[in-house]
Interface confidence: low
C-alpha cells in the first residue's frame, strides 16, 4: 500500500522516536516449509547454537557456527586451501526497557551468523 | 540484566499485544567492520538485490540471489554436481498500520535470503 502523502518515513529524523507496536505477528507462518538440512550437506557445514534471552523479543535466536576452518571436498576431507566463513546479517530485535515490567521496548541491532559459505581466502595459510 | 520477577515473557500468551517501542536503535554500529565480499569469493556466489518499502522499518533490506545452479570449482568453472542454494532466515520487521499516519506498527515476519552455500544435491543431475 502506498504511503499516505505527508507521512514521514520511519527512518526520517523528524519521525517520532517512540511508536506503538502490535505484537500479533503478521505472516506468522511464512516459513512453513520444513527446516532445511543445508547445514549438514554444505561444503561449509555448520552447527546451530541456541541463543536465549528472556529480556529480548524474540527470546530464542539460532546462531550458526562453521564446523571447520576449511571446506569439505568431494571425498569428505577438509581442504584448507578454502575457508568456511559465517554469513552474517544484522537483525532487529526488541529489548525490554528495564522499567519495572512496563511494556516498553527499545529496538536493538544484533549481528547474527545465519549459515556458512565456502570462500577462496585472500591470504592462504602458511605452508 | 535478569528479568524482573513476575514480568511476563514477551512471548507469553498473557503478555500485552501492544507495546511501546523506542526507535533509537541500541548497538547501531554493531557491524562496524567493512562489508564482506564473500558474495563474490564464494564457491556459491550471489548477487544482492535491494528490497525497498517505505511502509516498513527497516525500509531497505538486501536480498541474496544465487548466481548459478551449480557451484564454482577451483578453476572457475560451474560444477553442476553440486548446487548453490540460498540460506534463508526469518527476520522481524515493523509494518506501518494503515491508519492515517498514526505512529502504529505491527510486527511482521519476513523470510529473507542472506547468502548462498554449496550443497551436495540429494538427487544428482543426470550425466
Amino acid at each position: 500500500s502506498p504511503q499516505n502523502p505527508g507521512c514521514p518515513n520511519a527512518e526520517d529524523k523528524n519521525f517520532p522516536r517512540t511508536v506503538m507496536v502490535n505484537l500479533n505477528i503478521r505472516n506468522r507462518n511464512t516459513n512453513s516449509k520444513r527446516a532445511s538440512d543445508y547445514y549438514n550437506r554444505s561444503s561449509s557445514p555448520w552447527n546451530l547454537h541456541r541463543n536465549e534471552d528472556p529480556e529480548r523479543y524474540p527470546s530464542v535466536i539460532w546462531e550458526a557456527k562453521c564446523r571447520h576452518l576449511g571446506c569439505v571436498d568431494a571425498d569428505g576431507n577438509v581442504d584448507y586451501h578454502m575457508n568456511s566463513v559465517p554469513i552474517q546479517q544484522e537483525i532487529l530485535v526488541l529489548r525490554r526497557e528495564p522499567r519495572h515490567c512496563t511494556n516498553s521496548f527499545r529496538l536493538e541491532k544484533m549481528l547474527v551468523s545465519v549459515g556458512c559459505t565456502c570462500v577462496t581466502p585472500i591470504v592462504r595459510h602458511v605452508a | 540484566s535478569p528479568q524482573n520477577p513476575g514480568c511476563p515473557n514477551a512471548e507469553d500468551k498473557n503478555f500485552p499485544r501492544t507495546v511501546m517501542v523506542n526507535l533509537n536503535i541500541r548497538n547501531r554500529n554493531t557491524n562496524s567492520k567493512r562489508a564482506s565480499d564473500y558474495y563474490n569469493r564464494s564457491s556459491s556466489p550471489w548477487n544482492l538485490h535491494r528490497n525497498e518499502d517505505p511502509e516498513r522499518y527497516p525500509s531497505v533490506i538486501w536480498e541474496a540471489k544465487c548466481r548459478h545452479l551449480g557451484c564454482v570449482d577451483a578453476d572457475g568453472n560451474v560444477d553442476y554436481h553440486m548446487n548453490s542454494v540460498p540460506i534463508q532466515q526469518e527476520i522481524l520487521v515493523l509494518r506501518r498500520e494503515p491508519r492515517h499516519c498514526t505512529n502504529s506498527f505491527r510486527l511482521e515476519k519476513m523470510l529473507v535470503s542472506v547468502g548462498c552455500t554449496c550443497v551436495t544435491p540429494i538427487v544428482r543431475h543426470v550425466a
Epitope: H49, K65, C66, R67, H68, V78, N83, P121 | S36
Partner: nanobody, 117 residues
C-alpha cells in the same frame, strides 16, 4: 563495540616460553573461529594458528607445529597462544583475530614478541 585485546608479549631468550592472551568483548567467541597471526618487520602478516572451538578443528602453520598450542576459554571469552621453544625467527607483532577468513576480520592492536639473547 567489538574489541579484541592482546597481552602477554615481551622479550624472551631463545628456547624460552610465553603465553599470549586475547580478550574478546562485544561478541561471543563460541560462534567464531579465533586465531593468531604475526607480522615480522618487512614481512607480510601470516597465519600462525586458528581454533574452531565447536569441534576441535585446529590449524597450525608448519613453522610452529609442536611448539605452539592454541586454546579457547569460552567462559572468559578469551583465546590463548602458548609458545614454547621460541626461536629468533618467531620475533614479530602477534595479532589476535577472527580467522575463518583472512580478509573480513575483527583485529586486535597486536602485542610484540621479541626472541633474542
Amino acid at each position: 563495540e567489538v574489541q579484541l585485546v592482546e597481552s602477554g608479549g615481551g622479550l624472551v631468550q631463545p628456547g624460552g616460553s610465553l603465553r599470549l592472551s586475547c580478550a574478546a568483548s562485544g561478541f561471543t567467541l563460541g560462534y567464531y573461529a579465533i586465531g593468531w597471526f604475526r607480522q615480522a618487520p618487512g614481512k607480510e602478516r601470516e597465519g600462525v594458528s586458528c581454533d574452531s572451538s565447536s569441534d576441535g578443528d585446529t590449524y597450525y602453520a608448519n613453522s610452529v607445529k609442536g611448539r605452539f598450542t592454541i586454546s579457547t576459554d569460552n567462559g572468559k571469552n578469551t583465546v590463548y597462544l602458548q609458545m614454547n621453544s621460541l626461536k629468533p625467527e618467531d620475533t614479530a607483532v602477534y595479532y589476535c583475530a577472527t580467522c575463518t577468513d583472512w580478509n573480513y576480520d575483527y583485529w586486535g592492536q597486536g602485542t610484540q614478541v621479541t626472541v633474542s639473547s
